[in-house]
Interface confidence: medium
């Protein structure tokens, strides 16, 4: 049944990247508001986004407490303007979300190439370690801190003058690759969790960075750093 003139939420969807996690739902409210609750399988319900007219709720603060837990959320619908004074003991209509385990399901954000440095025929490419909102001992953890050896990076690199791509992989944030002397190369990286079997095992590719695109550079003899 449910409270008069309110519609239960539907299409509850988790949107999560690098553990920044938002629950979205429909419909856009007409004369109603929503409250969200979240819990672990064995925990108590905690209310968030009280009486909101939005159709999304940021649950990051809750899920980062333990990213390996499995969470369930539910969205309650209330009549607008009568939230506290309906006098009804009837439970408002609500809808449950799918279960969500952040460690398994959060999408990997687009990585960034922090720097590349050439010495002779070797280039060291460094991937920027993304910070997350996951904490340990009051310190924010990086993506590498959270995923450890489960996370690798794939480097795609090619001569500026050709389209043939080569790849390298690392389970740190650094690559050391061989290049041809006198050639400029372009680089792009992708974050990968190989042991995920789902569509979210790979990030989108980083922006492409190319050698020789800054004025006054000499790659042959010295070091080069490109920072964002």
């Amino acid at each position: 049944s449910g409270t008069t003139n309110t519609v239960a939420a539907y299409n509850l969807t988790w949107k999560s990247t690098n553990f920044k996690t938002i629950l979205e739902w429909e419909p856009k409210p007409i004369n109603q508001v929503y409250t969200v609750q979240i819990s672990t399988k064995s925990g108590d319900w905690k209310s968030k986004c009280f009486y909101t007219a939005d159709t999304e709720c940021d649950l990051t603060d809750e899920i980062v407490k333990d990213v390996k837990q499995t969470y369930l959320a539910r969205v309650f619908s209330y009549p607008a303007g009568h939230v506290e004074s309906t006098g009804s003991t009837e439970e408002p209509p609500y809808e449950n979300s799918p279960e969500f385990t952040p460690y398994l399901e959060t999408n990997l954000g687009q990585p960034t190439i922090q720097s590349f440095e050439q010495v002779g025929t070797k280039v060291n490419v460094t991937v920027q370690d993304e910070w997350t909102l996951v904490r340990r001992n009051d310190t924010f953890l990086s993506l590498r801190d959270v995923f450890g050896k489960d996370l690798i990076y794939t480097l795609y690199y090619w001569k500026s003058s050709s389209s043939g791509k080569k790849t390298a992989k690392t389970n740190t944030n650094e690559f050391l690759i061989d290049v041809d002397k006198g050639e400029n190369y372009c680089f792009s990286v992708q974050a990968v969790i190989p042991s995920r079997r789902t569509a979210n095992r790979k990030s989108t590719d980083s922006p492409v960075e190319c050698m020789g695109h800054e004025k006054g550079e000499s790659r042959e003899t010295g070091h080069h750093h490109h920072h964002h």
């Epitope: 399988k41 333990d66 390996k68 385990t101 050896k149 992989k169 042991s195």
Partner: antibody, heavy 118, light 107 residues
Framework: EVQLVQSGAEVKKPGASVKVSCKAS????????MNWVRQAPGQGLEWMGE????????TYNQKFKARVTMTVDQSTSTVYMELSSLRSEDTAVYYC???????????WGQGTTVTVSS | SIVMTQSPDSLAVSLGERATINCKAS??????IAWYQQKPGQSPKLLIY???NRYTGVPDRFSGSGYGTDFTLTISSLQAEDVAVYYC?????????FGGGTKVEIK
Amino acid sequence: EVQLVQSGAEVKKPGASVKVSCKASGYSFTGYYMNWVRQAPGQGLEWMGEINPSTGGSTYNQKFKARVTMTVDQSTSTVYMELSSLRSEDTAVYYCARRELGGPFGYWGQGTTVTVSS
Amino acid sequence: SIVMTQSPDSLAVSLGERATINCKASQSVSNGIAWYQQKPGQSPKLLIYFASNRYTGVPDRFSGSGYGTDFTLTISSLQAEDVAVYYCQQDYSSPWTFGGGTKVEIK
């Protein structure tokens, strides 16, 4: 179908070495760490170490660090575990096990019995 | 390294009855616990990971719970095919360590 097929039973003398193989099929071999776990007769499970098939890098249980070597052959999707300076207490069934995302061992080989006896 | 202590060592339960196995970690392992089933002469099989998530294909009579140091595997209605030794394992901190096992039999 994921399969981990191990080499056959071995009988070794004390002080010798044994090399056990584990051939993987049915999945992306370089995408998952391979672990080795042993089980002495009538006893529980004991983790020995793991190897990253993509890089060949390995991590060993301190207890076995001086005696164990794990290697990989990407061309045949096979990992190897060699244990040296064998003693009678190394008599056990040795399993390879694929580590799933986050830590658990989702697939196990059928086990290789190693008997150390003079 | 983290020590995992299982109790009881063995358990006899009537068919259709509930079986409960406990596992205690010597320090907090968050929910980094897996449970395995090993039948005689077979390799272990993964049942539960992240303390409470059933692995693919595992019947829903198996459930896991707990957080921190104390964990439980429950078989809600014991079937004949559930006779086995059950092990907990922490995958929170290397070296990964296992409990000593609990043998489940039919009463």
